[in-house]
């Protein structure tokens, strides 16, 4: 035979190929050996022109020999040399992960090495490289960023030889959102109990706002911006009060139109309304909700109803906010004055959740027309908002 070559070399395999002998032969005898590796001999059919070498040692120079046999006759031997690849380290793992540190551990390759190349990269593209000694099987990473996804890779080195890289992915602990802009981000940070939280409008730490987060209704992550429950708070307030907000966030309150404008300007939000009365419950969800700025007189956008309470908010869509001292509704009379409340009145209301608590006179009370009509004041009502894509964010967090 002639033209002996090797191909497809890995750390444990290679493929030997040759040109067949001109004469017809019975068989070929292949043998291969390396330093500290006993010789292996195999006989293959005379029709064969390649042979897969397996169970090789990594990073080892092999000498490969082949000759042909026909009966008692043997051809001359041809020889080729090849070196197997350096095998990779194994089981790279990140442990003891903290906000700024992590410990990488691995098992060494079978081949002897002169060192390891460690590469770790954060999602923002920051890459760091470090070379460690041949006897090292762990390395402490420091100066990491909190709440950051990292990819760590390791490669074995032996002189000019380099193994394939293996990798592991980890996330440093700490807040996913150091300055959560709403209750959904607070929830994604791991806070799952309803109560008072500080959010930061537009994620700006200078724009802190204390809010009540509902972390249980339909998956949670809701900023509650209105609560009626006992009639202790006066909701017949003026324009200035409704712009700024009033009440106790743990009890009855209104978060404020300026805050609603700033929150809904952060992205696409959905509205949820929860109603409760003598053991009965109902809800309404609108998948698009926003409140304009003061120049628009806090114009309401509310679209895409689903729920059990009935679509009473559609009537108010596109309306500006009205109070007894700033009449922006489309009625000749002042709706806020007539119904002793404030709302995005038209002429006048199907929803009057800021009406007089417990007042069952027509249209005067806490009303949601398509649930309890205008002659029944609802005992408990909450209005709340969260990002429309919260379900996607929540799924991503669970996968992570």
């Amino acid at each position: 035979p002639s033209g002996l070559v090797t191909a497809n070399i890995t750390d444990s395999e290679a493929l030997a190929r040759w040109q067949p002998a001109i004469a017809t032969v019975d068989s070929y005898v292949i043998s291969y050996t390396g330093e500290k590796v006993p010789e292996i001999t195999r006989t293959v059919s005379g029709n064969t022109v390649e042979y897969a070498l397996t169970d090789l040692e990594p990073a080892t120079e092999y000498t490969l020999r082949i000759f042909a046999e026909k009966g008692p006759q043997k051809s001359s031997t041809i020889t080729a040399k090849f070196t197997t690849d350096l095998d990779s380290p194994r089981d790279l793992t990140a442990t003891e992960v903290q906000s700024e540190t992590a410990l990488l551990t691995w098992r060494p390759p079978r081949a002897s090495v002169t060192g390891y190349l460690l590469v770790y990269e954060s999602v923002d593209g920051t890459v760091k490289e470090v070379i460690v000694g041949p006897d090292t099987t762990s390395y402490s990473l420091a100066d990491l960023s909190p709440s950051t996804h990292y990819t760590a890779k390791i490669q074995a080195l032996n002189g000019p030889l380099r193994s394939n890289m293996i990798q592991t992915i980890f996330t440093t602990i700490g807040l996913l959102y150091p300055f959560p802009k709403d209750c959904s981000q607070a929830m994604l940070n791991g806070d799952t109990t309803s109560g008072l939280y500080t959010i930061y409008l537009n994620g700006d730490k200078a724009e802190a706002l204390e809010v009540f987060c509902d972390m249980t209704s339909d998956g949670g992550g809701w900023i509650v911006f209105l609560r009626r429950k006992n009639g202790r708070e006066n909701f017949y307030q003026n324009w200035k009060a409704y712009a700024a907000g009033f009440g106790d966030r743990r009890e009855e309150f209104w978060l404020g139109l300026d805050n609603l404008n700033k929150i809904t300007a952060q992205g696409q939000y959905e509205l949820r309304v929860d109603l409760r009365d003598h053991g009965e419950t109902a809800f309404a969800v609108y998948d698009k909700f926003s409140v304009g700025d003061a120049k628009t007189r806090y114009k309401l956008k509310v679209e895409g109803y689903s729920g059990t309470a009935g679509d009473s908010m559609a009537y108010h869509n596109g309306r500006s906010f009205s109070t007894f001292d700033k009449d922006t509704d489309s009625a000749i009379t002042n709706c806020a004055l007539s119904y002793k409340g404030a709302f995005w009145y038209r002429n006048c209301h199907r929803v009057n959740l800021m009406g007089r608590y417990g007042d069952n006179n027509h249209s005067q009370g806490v009303n949601w027309f398509h649930w309890k009509g205008h002659e029944h004041s609802i005992q408990f009502a909450e209005m709340k908002l969260r990002p429309s894509n919260f379900r996607n964010l929540e799924g991503r967090r669970k996968r992570a």
Partner: antibody, heavy 120, light 107 residues
């Protein structure tokens, strides 16, 4: 421009069925509730049925409940009224109308109507 | 169902006169009241919604007022093109109901 065009009216015997259609153009059809209103010859207006923008909620006058079915195909910008078990008192000009904003609201756009005559 | 009662049923009026049509609801409906004009052989046309809001393109001689149960449509100076039948309609609750109509004709 905004337009509603009804079709499907005609002469039908009592007890038979008819399906009215209304083709809408010039506005975002699925944003608005739609209604059918009828007017018997020489008489006033009578609301018949309504349907929300998504089609998820439907409403009927007592006089047609159980006999008429309102539906819509938002992909085709079309409103329908399936009328079964027709009676002589259903004879009227049937108008399709667009709701101004919410499901129960003013009707700001009307079609020209399609005549349904129920007679043996 | 809410009954809507219009008066008068017929109103012969000279051109240029002021016209007042009233509509009464059988129960309190806030301002959920609309007015329509219908000419013979034509579809109704929305004039006033929410008791007092003039629909786009409707002349300013038309106006609406009222709240609760009693409502009024006023034409400040009747023009020849205003001779028609006028209907009130409540959109407060389903079924939405119309008044029986008021025919304004030439005196």
């Amino acid at each position: 421009q905004v337009q509603l065009v009804e079709s499907g009216g005609g002469l039908v015997q009592p007890g038979r069925s008819l399906r009215l259609s209304c083709a809408a153009s010039g506005f975002t059809f699925d944003d608005y509730a739609m209604h059918w209103v009828r007017q018997a010859p020489g008489k006033g207006l009578e609301w018949v049925s309504g349907i929300s923008g998504s089609g998820g909620s439907t409403y009927y006058a007592d006089s047609v409940k159980g006999r008429f079915t309102i539906s819509r195909d938002n992909a085709k910008n079309s409103l329908y009224l399936q009328m079964n078990s027709l009676r002589a008192e259903d004879t009227a000009l049937y108008y399709c109308a667009k709701s101004y904003q919410s499901d129960e609201d003013a009707f700001d756009i009307w079609g020209q109507g399609t005549m349904v005559t129920v007679s043996s | 169902d809410i009954q809507m009662t219009q008066s008068p049923a017929s109103l012969p009026t000279p051109v240029g006169d002021r016209v007042t049509i009233t509509c009464r609801a059988s129960q309190y409906i806030q301002g959920f009241l609309n007015w329509y004009q219908q000419k013979p052989g034509k579809a109704p046309k929305l004039l006033i919604y929410d008791a007092s809001n003039l629909e786009t393109g409707v002349p300013s001689r038309f106006s609406g007022s009222g709240s609760g149960t009693d409502f009024t449509l006023t034409i400040s100076s009747l023009q020849p093109e205003d001779f028609a039948t006028y209907y009130c309609q409540q959109s407060y609750s389903t079924p939405q109901t119309f008044g029986q109509g008021t025919k304004v004709d030439i005196k």
